[in-house]
């Protein structure tokens, strides 16, 4: 006699019996026997199981707590968890998105390289030579210095990473 030591995919071994796992969205009520297959029941409202399983309890859907700046991005089903995201102007503090923080602003001298999303913070970059940012902003990129020449003006004051150049009229030659 050779009882099973391994079972097929979507089965589990218990008491030398290969029983069918419950499908996603259902929980285990009773293991199979020689006479009856595994008994499963659908998860209740606000519960889910996302894999073939032998769990006796379904998992609760994640709660997107508005007090933590969270809102529902995708409602959960019996087979999937709820997906939370952050309110406008905020982003998740972790991949699990359990709380939110305000988007970071880029200080003067820095511009926005990548605008924040619900799951990622603002990415800032220093303004390179020829560019500046004179505000603290979560949206503004570095702006190019004004080109005095195209306005028939000359540079009166050099620009920095925080200030634009100051243009002025060209000196007139006296007759």
């Amino acid at each position: 006699p050779e009882p099973p030591t391994a079972c097929r995919e979507k089965q589990y071994l218990i008491n030398s019996q290969c029983c069918s796992l419950c499908q996603p969205g259902q929980k285990l009520v009773s293991d199979c026997t020689e006479f009856t297959e595994t008994e499963c029941l659908p998860c209740g409202e606000s519960e889910f199981l996302d894999t073939w399983n032998r769990e006796t309890h379904c998992h609760q859907h994640k709660y997107c707590d508005p007090n933590l700046g969270l809102r529902v991005q995708q409602k959960g089903t019996s087979e999937t968890d709820t997906i939370c995201t952050c309110e406008e102007g905020w982003h998740c503090t972790s991949e699990a998105c359990e709380s939110c923080v305000l988007h970071r602003s880029c200080s003067p001298g820095f511009g926005v390289k990548q605008i924040a999303t619900g799951v990622s913070d603002t990415i800032c970059e220093p303004c390179p030579v020829g560019f500046f940012s004179n505000v603290s902003s979560a949206f503004e990129k570095c702006h190019p210095w004004t080109s005095c020449e195209t306005k028939d003006l000359v540079v009166q004051q050099a620009g920095t990473n925080k200030t634009d150049v100051v243009c002025g009229p060209q000196d007139r030659l006296r007759a």
Partner: antibody, heavy 122, light 107 residues
Framework: EVQLVESGGGLVQPGGSLRLSCAAS????????MSWVRQAPGKGLEWVSA????????GYADSVKGRFTISRDNSKNTLYLQMNSLRAEDTAVYYC???????????????WGQGTLVTVSS | DIQMTQSPSSLSASVGDRVTITCRAS??????LAWYQQKPGKAPKLLIY???SLQSGVPSRFSGSGSGTDFTLTISSLQPEDFATYYC?????????FGQGTKVEIK
């Protein structure tokens, strides 16, 4: 290659007995539940009996309970069906079949023999 | 015992047709349903188990669906070798029970 070959069928009078055999080859016979299924001429399929891989437990359809006995000899890779007190309504082709996977008298059957005809008539 | 009822009991179809056979259980059997094909004078052949799992070696034109009490076997494009009788079987509890069969004939 999995093979199941039934034998022992034939003509028998009502009230008589017959023993069917099923010789298995090409797989680990001692690791599988086995079943007998019958089919009356021109009719559908009817599960008759099943037996655990070690012979330790058996299951029967109500229509044959107390009259038929399923058994196996794993050393000979052979399944048996002892049929007593035969009736006209037992007339059918009897198939032996292997359960698709371990455990359960109710499992789907993935390999079947060619069948042996049992005729109960006076 | 759980009663299995197939419909239709027979149907005529042409090669290339999409064919659908239904099976209804007298009580809920979750997804524990198998489908077999049987040709005259031959043993049944397992096509599908657990409602939708295709048995190894069975062409992909065969598919199964359903859960609870209502199930369907679909042949997406009928081939000459598919003319046969098809049976459903519940594999939820003992005794396993079969439908009465659906004969697929050439139109």
């Amino acid at each position: 290659e999995v093979q199941l070959v039934e034998s022992g069928g034939g003509l028998v009078q009502p009230g008589g007995s017959l023993r069917l055999s099923c010789a298995a080859s090409g797989f680990n016979f001692g690791g599988y539940y086995m079943s007998w299924v019958r089919q009356a001429p021109g009719k559908g399929l009817e599960w008759v009996s099943a037996i655990k891989y070690d012979g330790g437990s058996t299951g029967y359809a109500d229509s044959v309970k107390g009259r038929f006995t399923i058994s196996r000899d794993n050393s000979k890779n052979t399944l048996y069906l002892q049929m007593n007190s035969l009736r006209a309504e037992d007339t059918a082709v009897y198939y032996c079949a292997r359960a698709l996977y371990y455990t359960g008298f109710y499992r789907p059957l993935d390999y079947w023999g060619q069948g042996t005809l049992v005729t109960v008539s006076s | 015992d759980i009663q299995m009822t197939q419909s239709p009991s027979s149907l005529s179809a042409s090669v290339g047709d999409r064919v659908t056979i239904t099976c209804r259980a007298s009580q809920g059997i979750s997804s524990y349903l198998a489908w077999y094909q049987q040709k005259p004078g031959k043993a049944p052949k397992l096509l599908i188990y657990a409602a939708s799992s295709l048995q190894s070696g069975v062409p992909s034109r065969f598919s199964g669906s359903g859960s609870g009490t209502d199930f369907t076997l679909t042949i997406s494009s009928l081939q000459p070798e598919d003319f046969a009788t098809y049976y459903c079987q519940q594999h939820y509890t003992t005794p396993p029970t079969f439908g009465q069969g659906t004969k697929v004939e050439i139109k």
